[in-house]
């Protein structure tokens, strides 16, 4: 572990209350194929415990969705991954809109510091799928 | 190699017969930029040879496709990556539908064990592109 | 550094002149969360300085885009990542079309050699977003 191979892969637990756009995550072998090895969860949000450059990746699929579903709703459905705390480091790292699709998936390299908490904000009014092969979020430490 | 840096990047060889939704892969420098360093191919399916957490990634593009192609077909075109053998470990790891798009691309971290064979099932009646820059599938061992 | 952990994450600087489909990138902490640790930029194009297998990833979002924007334009908007120099190694590594979406994102493993310059060609007449959470391009050395 001293090599700094911090890594986590999370599955969706639930969405937040109406005014809270954050997705709440869970992880652990008992839940399926999700795990936390280094990073930790704080009220469903992922907290980094080791400084470094991380590969952050995410896939979110909307529930009961067809190519026309997203066009039925007035507000665009957008997923943003960012550092939400500490407030001094708050920034959006990765952002995608669904448009006429039902799934977004992406990844990026970004420096993260111990104590950074990552939030995944799903704006719009569509419920994401909780299937573990359709919606997941993970980080992988890749170098100091 | 003892570090466990198992890695593979594959290109599409062919689709299966009509009732077989699996994509059949190939790899090796003679074929282009695909390679297998650790994992192996068993009848076009990728077999893992070392336990660990892997980053699995895939991109599949449909052949002769426009944004209307996928909507013309009644059956949704879906790509699922999963462990197909041994049967006791069979599970879907990653799933995406094309909807009104012609390409899906995603990645995830997942624990895999020696002997796990990964299958990539393309359901629907649309043919995937065999261009090596449009359709590819790979795994990378990232930690024990 | 001797471990060969070459890595870079870039943000969009600007597009090329009318007949030049290349995207021009920039990187460095002063610019935000982009960085170059090993690879270098040559006139906005990424040059590799160490042989090995790399994970290449990209996300490009079109500016002022809705699901109908891309369908309004006659020429399909396509993003291709490839080796553009040296000419002897010129090849397309990864290619995606936007179709009715506004964002493409993908990743792949590929062998790269010292001196390879990667180009990201955006064909079509739509302007990409320069927002750093919407458009980015990166490489990560993963093994010799």
């Amino acid at each position: 572990e001293s090599l700094g191979w911090d890594i986590a892969e999370l599955q969706l637990n639930h969405t937040g209350p109406q005014q809270d756009p954050r997705l709440y995550w869970q992880g652990g072998p008992a839940l399926g194929r999700s795990f936390l090895r280094g990073p930790e969860l704080d009220k469903g949000q992922l907290r980094i415990r080791r400084d470094g450059i991380y590969m952050v990746h995410i896939q979110v699929t909307l529930a009961i969705c067809s190519s026309t579903s997203t066009s039925r709703h007035h507000h665009p459905t957008t997923l943003a991954v960012g550092i939400c705390s500490p407030a001094s480091r708050s920034i959006s790292l990765l952002r995608l809109s669904f448009h006429q699709g039902c799934t977004i998936a992406s990844q990026r390299l970004t420096p993260l510091a111990r104590g950074d908490t990552l939030c995944t904000n799903l704006t719009g009014t569509l419920l994401p799928s909780r299937n573990t092969d359709e919606t997941f979020f993970g980080v992988q430490w890749v170098r100091p | 190699e003892s570090l466990g840096w198992d890695i593979a990047e594959l290109q599409l060889n062919h689709t299966g017969p009509q009732q077989d939704p699996r994509l059949y892969w190939q790899g090796g420098p003679a074929l282009g930029r695909s390679f297998l360093r650790g994992p192996e191919l068993d009848k076009g399916q990728l077999r893992i040879r070392r336990d660990g957490i892997y980053m699995v990634h895939i991109q599949v593009t449909l052949a002769i496709c426009s944004s209307t192609s996928t909507s013309r077909h009644h059956h949704p075109t879906t790509l699922a990556v999963g462990i197909c053998s041994p049967a006791s470990r069979s599970i879907s790891l990653l799933r995406l539908s094309f909807h009104q798009g012609c390409t899906i691309a995603s990645q995830r971290l997942t624990p895999l064990a020696r002997g796990d064979t990964l299958c990539t099932n393309l359901t629907g009646t649309l043919l995937p592109s065999r261009n090596t820059d449009e359709t590819f599938f790979g795994v990378q061992w990232v930690r024990p | 550094e001797s471990l060969g952990w070459d890595i870079a994450e870039l943000q969009l600087n600007h597009t090329g002149p009318q007949q030049d489909p290349r995207l021009y990138w920039q990187g460095g902490p002063a610019l935000g969360r982009s960085f170059l640790r090993g690879p270098e930029l040559d006139k906005g194009q990424l040059r590799i300085r160490r042989d090995g297998i790399y994970m290449v990833h990209i996300q490009v979002t079109l500016a002022i885009c809705s699901s109908t924007s891309t369908s309004r334009h006659h020429h399909p908007t396509t993003l291709a990542v490839g080796i553009c120099s040296p000419a002897s190694r010129s090849i397309s590594l990864l290619r995606l079309s936007f179709h009715q979406g506004c964002t493409i994102a993908s990743q792949r493993l590929t062998p790269l050699a010292r001196g390879d310059t990667l180009c990201t060609n955006l064909t079509g007449t739509l302007l990409p977003s320069r927002n750093t959470d919407e458009t980015f391009f990166g490489v990560q050395w993963v093994r010799p």
């Epitope: 109406q18 529930a63 026309t68 039925r72 359709e134 | - | -």
Partner: antibody, heavy 120, light 111 residues
Framework: EVQLQESGPGLVQPSQSLSITCTVS????????VHWVRQSPGKGLEWLGV???????DYNADFISRLSISKDNSKSQVFFKMDSLQSDDTAIYFC??????????????WGQGTSVTVSS | DIVLTQSPASLAVSLGQRATISCRAS??????????MHWYQQKPGQPPKLLIY???NLESGVPARFSGSGSGTDFTLNIHPVEEEDAATYYC?????????FGGGTKLEIK
């Protein structure tokens, strides 16, 4: 406070059209979808159709040929029109707001309903 | 169309006891990690009122004595302890696919 109020004719002649207006307050039609449901002693509760926040509509296939739903966002009104009514269309007609989650399709607020009798 | 069959059609439960109402779907209404089944209460002369959504989520303002469970094709609404004001007809509704359909209703009487 969220409210929906239907206003309709009460009595409709057989083969004629039924028009109902649903006036809403406490929420915006640009954010929420509105469903139409009817209730009769013979058939219980029947979902008829929905108009989404964008104005796109979905209808129960059994009614698609004779049903249209439209709206005026600025007036906070949804309009329901069903053609060729017969006696078995006699029912209470409700408009109902879709739940906050657009793809959940539960109905969290309902109008009081308007009673429609089809008779000559 | 998905047919929802409720049972029993009516039941009488003593004050303070448990009322259990069943709803069976002709095919699974579970997908995407949720069960798209909802429960409503309707009193005479009033519109239906949403009690439970996604099989087990209590709608805001609904008393905690109401609970829902189930997945796939079999769902249950429980009321415990039953109170006088719970006398009503209860309906299940699915939203797995179009058209959305309702169960035939279960009339609850308090003894």
């Amino acid at each position: 406070e969220v409210q929906l109020q239907e206003s309709g004719p009460g009595l409709v002649q057989p083969s004629q059209s039924l028009s109902i207006t649903c006036t809403v307050s406490g929420f915006s039609l640009t954010t929420y979808a509105v469903h139409w449901v009817r209730q009769s002693p013979g058939k219980g509760l029947e979902w008829l159709g929905v108009i989404w926040s964008t104005g796109i509509t979905d209808y129960n296939a059994d009614f698609i040929s004779r049903l249209s739903i439209s709206k005026d966002n600025s007036k906070s009104q949804v309009f329901f029109k069903m053609d060729s009514l017969q006696s078995d269309d006699t029912a209470i007609y409700f408009c109902a707001r879709n739940h906050y989650y657009g793809n959940l399709n539960a109905m969290d607020y309902w109008g009081q309903g308007t009673s429609v009798t089809v008779s000559s | 169309d998905i047919v929802l069959t409720q049972s029993p059609a009516s039941l009488a439960v003593s004050l303070g006891q448990r009322a259990t109402i069943s709803c069976r779907a002709s095919k699974s209404v579970s997908t995407s990690g949720y069960s798209f089944m909802h429960w409503y209460q309707q009193k005479p002369g009033q519109p239906p009122k949403l009690l439970i959504y996604l099989a087990s989520n209590l709608e805001s303002g609904v008393p905690a004595r109401f609970s829902g469970s189930g997945s796939g094709t079999d769902f249950t609404l429980n009321i415990h302890p039953v109170e006088e004001e719970d006398a009503a007809t209860y309906y299940c509704q699915h939203s797995r696919e179009l058209p959305y359909t309702f169960g035939g209703g279960t009339k609850l009487e308090i003894k």
